[in-house]
Interface confidence: low
Amino acid sequence: QAGPLPKPTLWAEPGSVISWGNSVTIWCQGTLEAREYRLDKEESPAPWDRQNPLEPKNKARFSIPSMTEDYAGRYRCYYRSPVGWSQPSDPLELVMTGAYSKPTLSALPSPLVTSGKSVTLLCQSRSPMDTFLLIKERAAHPLLHLRSEHGAQQHQAEFPMSPVTSVHGGTYRCFSSHGFSHYLLSHPSDPLELIVSGSLEDPRPSPTRSVSTAAGPEDQPLMPTGSVPHSGLRRHWE
């Protein structure tokens, strides 16, 4: 054997963020020599699953008929060939939404904002939570993650944007979560449409701090400057 077997590719359909009760299929794609595939879930006392490969043997399907809290988490897969086991795949983070009641998303002072001005998106939950996430639809890396300090739970998080440019315009939703599981999120808030008008064009927003090596404005995360400190953790969901 000339070196380790190549690692398989792991992905989820229709995606890795799944609403409670919906079905999801996890795929593991290896090589044509694969004889068996296994799926592991991190920190799970149970093994996850094993499957015989589907013809032509280069991938296997792991089905979750109804998404629940138990299925949320971080997965890796492996395959066995006649010469041994592959390297593990890169991890797949399967997130369930619908674990908690939906928060409310609003814009202060208004969802109608002039380019160059400031706006703050406010995500409020009914019960105290320690993590808030802001999603922008159709962004390449749509997640902004806020975690409160020292695990102190709060009812809201502020996502300031300054200065606002046209790329900030679009549809946003937010989620809330408890720190004990990053993979369980609330129902999404109702959508908020942020409308940017005016001619003070800045081709790229300049956030207070950047944690992204993004290639374009859509990839640039919006950084908080408010009272809830950034955790330094970001997940990129497709």
């Epitope: 004889r35 068996e36 296994r38 592991d40 149970a46 093994p47 996850w48 699953d49 094993r50 499957q51 015989n52 089905s63 008929p65 138990d70 492996y78 066995r80 041994g84 086991w85 593990p88």
Partner: antibody, heavy 121, light 107 residues
Amino acid sequence: EVKLLESGGGLVQPGGSLKLSCAASGFDFSRYWMIWVRQAPEKGLEWIGEINPDSSTINYTPSLKDKFIISRDNAKNTLYLQMSKVRSEDTALYYCARPYYRYDVGYFDVWGAGTTVTVSS
Amino acid sequence: DIVMTQAPKVLLVSAGDRVTISCKASQSVSNAVVWYQQKPGQSPKLLIFYASNRYTGVPDRFTGSGYGTDFTFSISTVQAEDLAVYFCQQDYSSPWTFGGGTKLEIK
């Protein structure tokens, strides 16, 4: 408490049929592969076959493939073994067990107490 | 099918003895060997997996080792409750197969 309880064993004539059941409790049955293993009197253990959680994959030991059928009903938390064309060599204690499969590790960590099948005329 | 051959078939022991059981696979099974204990009238109980890993709650007098085709299972200090039949099993290639068993009996 995680438990498996086999039933359905008994005396059966050569060439006859019998259906064994295994009732599972204390764990999420619908998420686990399940297996059947048998042990002839004063003999070793023989793996009969296995079934995956949604019944889409069922594997048998080759010599038993044409006479045994493994199935499951997740709504009833029950595993089944349909035996047909039985012969005296099928006389054994039949166990259902829960396998643990993780990466390149596989073992059977939960076993039932077994049910006895005796093939005799 | 992979054949697992255990030796000896019977082992006569006294309390306090150290015992070793051998299991040979007909082809390489890497580390994928499991050991079970079966006491009279009981179902098998998992002791060792992945050749050398003790299962939860298994006393440390039970150990396993080996790789490829040759595996051993040892009990460092046999106690009365260890009298049982011990089986090896390979989890390398389906169908999963067991050794014929080794019975520990009092001298």
